[in-house]
């Protein structure tokens, strides 16, 4: 006889990455016919739902108005049906960012590269961290995780054009505070045509809104999103 | 600016009962959750009881379960707090909290921690002695 429910599924909108001050909604999803949701915080209890009518209902949503380094840490959620209660989810890690100063990033040689050429990217913060990030934007949500005092090198080696795409830095006070994003660099890589029209580049976010990679749809892709932003949380463990 | 005032602590002896009282003013009452708390002599804020907006969804600690219940009247800005069969171990003083932000909260959802709560009343002080 079953003692557990499957796990439910948690993730973060409009990102796991929330600007300071800024509003974040913890969703999690678990079954049609749940009675009760709770939401946990590094392993304590921090809000409960209790859906109505649940057996229309199989996602719930934990509304966070006011992003800050009191909120940021792991969230996970369990739910219950009947008296059956679930495996809990995967961890959830919510960062704040925007906190303190902001990082240079460089790259060399250049932002121009020839396929097979060796690109060192270069995030410098003169502030008290000695952790930084790089990240590429895009679904993949390339996250490289570097070190040093007041600069970290993130060597990428020979490049290919899938390399192609635009990066930001943070420097991160601990695991779940991080410092403004760099101005963006784009890094162009060119090949030879063939190779270069054929290399799909990641969607990258609008200018304004980097950081916020929405996914509107309700179903299908929830799933993608939470593998998705379990690339960049896998460095934060 | 948001003021939480709190009312009805008071001495009560042991099985007794007591009504506590928040009044809320500065912020859009009836559509925010929220939470008692206590904190007895030396001991830390201790969660007590949670209500949703819309009333739909209440949750205790343990230990005042089917002794206390939270209640609001968002027609007149006030929650409550009705405690019964009252001990001594309930001694504390009590704090009502709203969280902050906006009106984007769940119909059904309510924050047990504290850090979850923006605003806090001053307190009241609940004694329970012979």
């Known amino acids: 006889q079953q003692q557990t429910l499957p796990k439910p599924f948690i993730w973060a909108e409009p990102h796991f990455m929330v600007p300071k001050e800024k509003q974040v909604t913890i969703c999690c999803q678990g079954n049609y016919g749940a009675v009760e949701y709770q939401l946990h915080f590094e392993g304590s209890l921090f809000a409960v739902d209790r859906p109505k009518p649940p057996e229309r209902i199989n996602k719930v949503q934990f509304y966070i108005p006011d992003m800050n380094s009191r909120m940021a840490g792991q969230y996970s959620c369990i739910y219950r049906v009947g008296e059956l209660w679930s495996e809990p989810s995967n961890l959830l890690d919510l960062v704040v960012t925007e906190m303190y100063d902001t990082p240079t990033l460089s790259v060399h040689p250049g932002p121009e590269v020839i396929s097979g050429e060796k690109v060192t990217f270069y995030c410098r913060l003169d502030t008290a961290t000695s952790m930084f990030l790089l990240l590429k934007e895009g679904r993949s949500s390339h996250v490289q995780r570097g070190y040093g005092k007041v600069q970290a090198e993130f060597p990428l080696g020979p490049v290919t054009t899938a390399h192609r795409g635009t990066y930001r830095c943070f420097g991160s006070y601990n695991n779940h505070a991080w410092s403004f994003p760099s101005e963006p660099v784009k890094l162009l890589v060119t090949g030879d045509i063939e190779n270069t029209s054929l290399a799909p580049e990641d969607p990258t976010f609008p200018a304004d809104t980097w950081g916020t990679y929405l996914l509107t749809t309700e179903t299908g892709l929830q799933k993608d999103h939470a593998l998705w932003d379990h690339t960049a949380q896998n460095l934060l463990r | 600016e948001v003021q939480l005032v709190e009312s009805g602590g008071g001495l009560v002896q042991p099985g007794g009962s007591l009504r506590l009282s928040c009044a809320v003013s500065?912020?859009?009452?009836?559509?925010?959750?929220m939470g008692w708390f206590r904190q007895a002599p030396g001991k830390g804020r201790e969660f007590v009881a949670a209500i949703s907006w819309s009333s739909s969804t209440t949750y205790y600690a343990d230990s005042v379960k089917g002794r206390f219940t939270i209640s609001r009247d968002n027609s007149k800005n006030t929650a409550y707090l009705q405690m019964n069969s009252l001990r001594a171990e309930d001694t504390a003083v009590y704090y009502c909290?709203?969280?902050?932000?906006?009106?984007?909260?769940?119909?059904?959802?309510?924050?047990?921690?504290?850090?979850?709560?923006?605003?806090w009343g001053q307190g009241t002080l609940v004694t329970v002695s012979s």
């Open positions: 909290a709203a969280v902050g932000g906006s009106l984007d909260y769940s119909a059904t959802v309510v924050y047990t921690a504290a850090r979850a709560y923006a605003d």
């Open positions: 500065g912020r859009t009452f009836s559509r925010l959750p």
